[in-house]
Amino acid sequence: PTGAVEVQVPEDPVVALVGTDATLRCSFSPEPGFSLAQLNLIWQLTDTKQLVHSFTEGRDQGSAYANRTALFPDLLAQGNASLRLQRVRVADEGSFTCFVSIRDFGSAAVSLQVAAPYSKPSMTLEPNKDLRPGDTVTITCSSYRGYPEAEVFWQDGQGVPLTGNVTTSQMANEQGLFDVHSVLRVVLGANGTYSCLVRNPVLQQDAHGSVTITGQPMTFPPEA
């Protein structure tokens, strides 16, 4: 509305896997005759306005964010102000603002969504021997080091959802990754298969685990 420099970023969040590099795209339209000496570029955390990376006084001032950020110097003159964030961590998740100042100034915010896939669930049974129809057992489904928090679903061998008597807990480790433990209490039939599905809502990734109880003995599917 003011004729100020127009800064463009993706509307959708940028999804990055933990440990990988992410590019936060940002662009502006340089006017004819534009030179990098005119450019002042600031990347910052949106909420706090804490400096992440800057390009001022005609040069890259470097990373102010754990030395894990970089610009694309060869592309700046064409209006590419994107930021490379290396070795993404859970703590990086959030909104980043790209602030561009040339003759005037403008800004735009881009969201970083961090994700990590969950491991294939391991299944344990308690008690795990001398089982008879009518016994109550607890089946525990454990999946590790995922992000964000998982959705857990249980079903029987016929694909019927099991929603009662399920307790799910999720604990974050020091890196912010979640370990999920879901416990199903069930009364055994003559035989049966019990499956747990751990879903990462961001990656739309499903990790499956199942246990089959056939009187004596019980069998566990081999690990994939």
């Epitope: 306005k49 804490q50 909104s95 915010a109």
Partner: antibody, heavy 124, light 109 residues
Framework: QVQLVQSGAEVKKPGSSVKVSCKAS????????INWVRQAPGQGLEWMGG????????NYAQKFQGRVTITADESTSTAYMELSSLRSDDTAVYYC?????????????????WGQGTTVTVSS | DIQMTQEPSLTTSPGGTVTLTCRSS?????????ANWVQEKPGQAPRGLIG???KRAPGTPARFSGSLIGGKAALTITGVQPEDEAIYFC?????????FGGGTKLEIK
């Protein structure tokens, strides 16, 4: 403690221009936006524009485009707002207000420091 | 033009709690709008109370808090004091400019 001290009251004729100054003192380092905000009698606050003194770049509200010029002199820590083609409805109190572009403390306090205001009266 | 809507006036009692809101014509207010709340009393310059949605400026009493509620910026005063009678303006940042709301006149009875 940062303070913003503005120039004194002005009485101007319609069609003329006025230039108001805003001097920052006390811990003026960092990257700041100096905003100019006015308040006409009995009215609310109205953002006119702002400048980043360190970069010398300014933006203006559409309503004032072409009639307002905001400048800054980094060496004296002073920002200026010049409004031309004055009309009677430009009679107002004009304020400068500091806003952080980058929060060096890691906390964004927003427009936390305001000048005392400069009364501009436009009358024939 | 971006329009911002505040309650024209609100009345509360000393010791009570009151919430002032600020709605934007562009849709939900987000953290990237850096909602500011400014207090103005007769004959005094405006005073910045809250910046960055919920950060109290130095000197702002703890009874003032900022937040986002239902897509609007909000200022809550908990344990209202007689000296809180004033006009409160919100301001939102839109990429390259600030826009002020029309103000809420808070009366303490």
């Amino acid at each position: 403690q940062v303070q913003l001290v503005q120039s004194g009251a002005e009485v101007k004729k319609p069609g003329s221009s006025v230039k108001v100054s805003c001097k920052a003192s006390g811990g003026t380092g960092g990257i700041y936006l100096i905003n100019w905000v006015r308040q006409a009698p009995g009215q609310g606050l109205e953002w006119m524009g702002g400048i980043i003194p360190l970069f010398g770049t300014a933006n203006y509200a559409q309503k004032f485009q072409g009639r307002v010029t905001i400048t800054a002199d980094e060496s004296t820590s002073t920002a200026y707002m010049e409004l031309s083609s004055l009309r009677s409805d430009d009679t107002a109190v004009y304020y400068c207000a500091r806003d952080q572009v980058v929060a060096t403390s890691g906390v964004n306090f927003g427009m936390d420091v305001w000048g005392q205001g400069t009364t501009v009266t436009v009358s024939s | 033009d971006i329009q911002m809507t505040q309650e024209p006036s609100l009345t509360t009692s000393p010791g009570g709690t009151v919430t002032l809101t600020c709605r934007s014509s562009t849709g939900a207010v987000t953290t990237s709008n850096y909602a500011n709340w400014v207090q103005e009393k007769p004959g005094q310059a405006p005073r910045g109370l809250i910046g960055g949605t919920n950060k109290r400026a130095p000197g702002t009493p703890a009874r003032f808090s900022g937040s986002l509620i239902g897509g609007k910026a909000a200022l809550t005063i908990t344990g209202v004091q007689p000296e809180d009678e004033a006009i409160y303006f919100c301001a939102l940042w839109y990429s390259n400019l600030w826009v002020f709301g029309g103000g809420t006149k808070l009366e303490i009875k």
